[in-house]
Interface confidence: medium
């Protein structure tokens, strides 16, 4: 009973975590304009992984996609890749874990097979969570570095003269969503791995670990990893990235081209 509960809870926690990772990846507020020295600014800038937005004091909002891959900073590309890898691994993990759930009967599937699948999904959730946490942390580090650089530039100029105030960016809501979501996915993965131990005898567990440790890297990496790094496969982002027409749910989840309408 405790095993079923642990497995079920692990699945639910991971599901919430992966939903959060997807939400964070799609959010526009990865970095937001720091208003410390400019609290009554006429425009408010914020940026996501896929586009940047400006909100006017009138409430009119304009978002414009980054319409080039080659011209984007390598760090941004890396963060995109990490988040997408995290989503893909998490999605595959969810699929595997559904069949692994003890409360779901599929034919005459043995507990040892369910244990193997539980462990596989658990490892995938852990890696997925780590990818998300790494992606968000890389972006946050990039922001911190740029923030203090632009702060220094604000007060030190040619011959001591104060330069024009630059727009400085600070942590956006997406970063916190990403950290929490990554953490939840990681916790869910750990719970799945713990549940795996109670699903089969010790000997089976040992075999499952040794087989899947190698089996994961051999069986999943070529298909899952490579497929996930092609941005084209992420239709939601591709639509926005290509601009032009947007599906209804995309327009709702993204403010719009003008983040001041």
């Amino acid at each position: 009973m405790a095993v079923t509960a642990c497995q079920g809870l692990g699945f639910v926690v991971s599901l919430i975590g992966i939903a959060g990772i997807i939400a964070a990846t799609c959010m526009d507020q990865w970095s937001t304009q720091d208003l410390y020295n400019n609290p009554v600014t006429a425009v408010f800038n914020y940026q996501g992984l896929w586009r940047s937005c400006v909100r006017e004091s009138s409430g009119f909002t304009e978002c414009r996609g980054y319409f080039t891959l080659l011209g984007l900073p390598a760090m941004l590309q890396a963060v995109r890749a990490l988040m997408i890898v995290g989503i893909v691994l998490g999605a595959i993990g969810l699929l595997v874990s559904i069949f692994a759930l003890k409360c779901i009967r599929i034919g005459s599937m043995e507990d040892s097979a369910k244990a193997n699948m539980t462990l596989t999904s658990g490892i995938m959730f852990i890696v997925s969570g780590l990818c998300a946490i790494a992606g968000v942390s890389v972006f946050a580090n990039m922001l911190v570095t740029n923030f203090w650089m632009s702060t220094a530039n604000m007060y030190t100029g040619m011959g001591g003269m104060v330069q024009t105030v630059q727009t400085r960016y600070t942590f956006g809501a997406a970063l916190f969503v990403g950290w929490v979501a990554g953490g939840l996915t990681l916790i869910g993965g750990v719970m799945m791995c713990i549940a795996c131990r109670g699903l089969a005898p010790e000997e089976t567990n040992y075999k499952a670990v040794s087989y899947h440790a190698s089996g994961h890297s051999v069986a999943y990496k070529p298909g899952g990893f490579k497929a996930s790094t092609g941005f084209g496969s992420n239709t939601k982002n591709k639509k926005i990235y290509d601009g032009g027409a947007r599906t209804e749910d995309e327009v709702q989840s993204y403010p719009s081209k003008h983040d001041y309408v």
Partner: antibody
Framework: QVQLQQSGPVLVKPGASVKMSCKAS????????MNWVKQSHGKSLEWIGI????????SYNQKFRGKATLTVDKSSNTAYMDLNSLTSEDSAVYYC????????????WGQGTSLTVSS | DVVMTQIPFSLPVSLGDQASISCRSS???????????LHWYLQKPGQSPKLLIY???DRFSGVPDRFSGSKSGTDFTLKISRVEAEDLGVYFC?????????FGSGTKLEIK
């Protein structure tokens, strides 16, 4: 093909109001922004405002706030502009122009609606 | 508001000549996403404006390759390599980086 069909010329008396229309065809109406632009006789172009037909978001040029009101009817793919308290200064040709999210430019324009305010 | 200063007001040219129209913005037109939303339009007598060039140098569909755009800081230039009769009219530059969007005063291209 993309077409923006505007309503015909209007002659009104000072102090009156007018509503002009711009019917869009040949594209998905809610996927593009609609701008309104004023061109006084022999003068340059002045941007009045922009409307997001999807969510109803609007931004006006401060100069035209209170003068112009932008609306849309999504069911008929038509954008409207109301102009109130008209004076001779408002006599001009008014254009609607679609704006593409990729280019940020007004890529297709209506033929214009000529407004004459005269007593 | 961003002021777009266009020169010259009038540009007399001979057919087949090269024409160059300048437009200067009062502030940077580089959007926070890195794009520069400066566009060129041609308005022929009795017609509505038509988009020629968007984002400084991208030709709109159907626009001949004799039209090209370039930038240097806040100075923008539209070049017509070989002027044809159908190119005559008033050319406007416009920016959509900052609201309110603004237009240049126009340059009238006419036959010498």
């Amino acid at each position: 093909q993309v077409q923006l069909q505007q309503s015909g010329p209007v002659l009104v008396k000072p102090g009156a109001s007018v509503k002009m229309s711009c019917k869009a065809s040949g594209y998905t109406f809610t996927d593009y922004y609609m701008n309104w632009v004023k061109q006084s006789h022999g003068k340059s172009l002045e941007w009045i405002g922009i409307f997001n037909p999807y969510n109803g978001g609007i931004s006006y040029n401060q100069k035209f706030r209170g003068k112009a009101t932008l609306t849309v009817d999504k069911s008929s793919n038509t954008a409207y502009m109301d102009l109130n308290s008209l004076t001779s200064e408002d006599s001009a040709v008014y254009y609607c122009a679609r704006e593409d999210g990729n280019s940020g430019a007004m890529d297709y324009w209506g033929q214009g609606t000529s407004l004459t305010v005269s007593s | 508001d961003v002021v777009m200063t266009q020169i010259p007001f009038s540009l007399p040219v001979s057919l087949g000549d090269q024409a160059s129209i300048s437009c200067r913005s009062s502030q940077s037109l580089v959007h926070s996403n890195g794009n520069t939303y400066l566009h060129w339009y041609l308005q022929k007598p009795g017609q509505s404006p038509k988009l020629l060039i968007y984002k400084v140098s991208d030709r709109f569909s159907g626009v001949p390759d004799r039209f090209s755009g370039s930038k240097s800081g806040t100075d923008f230039t539209l070049k017509i390599s070989r002027v044809e009769a159908e190119d005559l009219g008033v050319y406007f530059c416009s920016q959509t980086t900052h609201a309110p969007f603004t237009f240049g005063s126009g340059t009238k291209l006419e036959i010498k």
